[in-house]
Amino acid sequence: KESCDVQLYIKRQSEHSILAGDPFELECPVKYCANRPHVTWCKLNGTTCVKLEDRQTSWKEEKNISFFILHFEPVLPNDNGSYRCSANFQSNLIESHSTTLYVTDVKSASERPSKDEMASRPWLLYR
């Protein structure tokens, strides 16, 4: 039977390689049955996850999944790091796996890993 619990679909070790100066949308796919839960993003700082209060967020829908989006407009070098989304559902807190942003400064874009390098590092798939 399909679960009616809230589910967050961020795959483990998810990573994104992005350029500073570009816009970027970090998605938290959320599946729920009735009332949409309250979802937040936080950024990992050591063992604590610091809530991102004053950031632009939005929702979008595709099929039967809702995506809670954290907007980076534009991406800044200090956006580098790991993020997690959390959903409050019937007084339960559900946390996603973390997703990591690797921000390359435009000035050092030539130092980005090559496609061949990435292909030889399959654990970076989807990340």
Partner: antibody
Amino acid sequence: QVQLVQSGAEVKKPGASVKVSCKASGFTFSSFGMHWVRQAPGQGLEWMGYISSGISTIYYADKFQGRVTMTRDNSKNTLYMELSSLRSEDTAVYYCARDWLRGYAMDYWGQGTTVTVSS
Amino acid sequence: DIVLTQSPSSLSASVGDRVTITCRASQSIDYDGDSYMNWYQQKPGKPPKLLIYAASNLDFGIPARFSGSGSGTDFTLTISSLQPEDFATYYCQQSNEDPWTFGGGTKVEIK
């Protein structure tokens, strides 16, 4: 609605190369990773590899490493797969498929491109 | 690579029957409570169609007679009441580890 339309059937000689295209519509192509899967006549499905939305990650199954090249042109909403050094065992239907939820599954598939390798 | 073994490889059933297909993985495809198992339906001359992802989640538009269950290494696809349009080949597929792999398929035929 989401559509993935692939290029037409190809007949190639052993040792040649083939390039299959996959034109996407009905969704923001540049936001989705894409996969290639093939199916030999009367056989099961075989995953060939993946290319991420922004091409920063490309992964080929070991079996195809060195012979396959996956590329995409986000400005044209088109995905490509080139397979070189063709042999008769490469005769198959080749499918492109959209990645769903960044690495969970493949949710929309092209209609398939038949590649026949014969001397 | 993770090997997926489907059983049976084929079965004959009638409209209205309950049909169960199993898929066993050579190693666990769970991680931290998530099961990375998907099920597809394929009809002759057509591409596969996603039915279920993450072991038990019905893809959008898929009828509720299809359901998926299981964890670790053992997974099941169930069709609660077989309909004429369900006669097809069904594949399991894991996305826990690269390369992604498929089971050998189960052909559901009319009895």
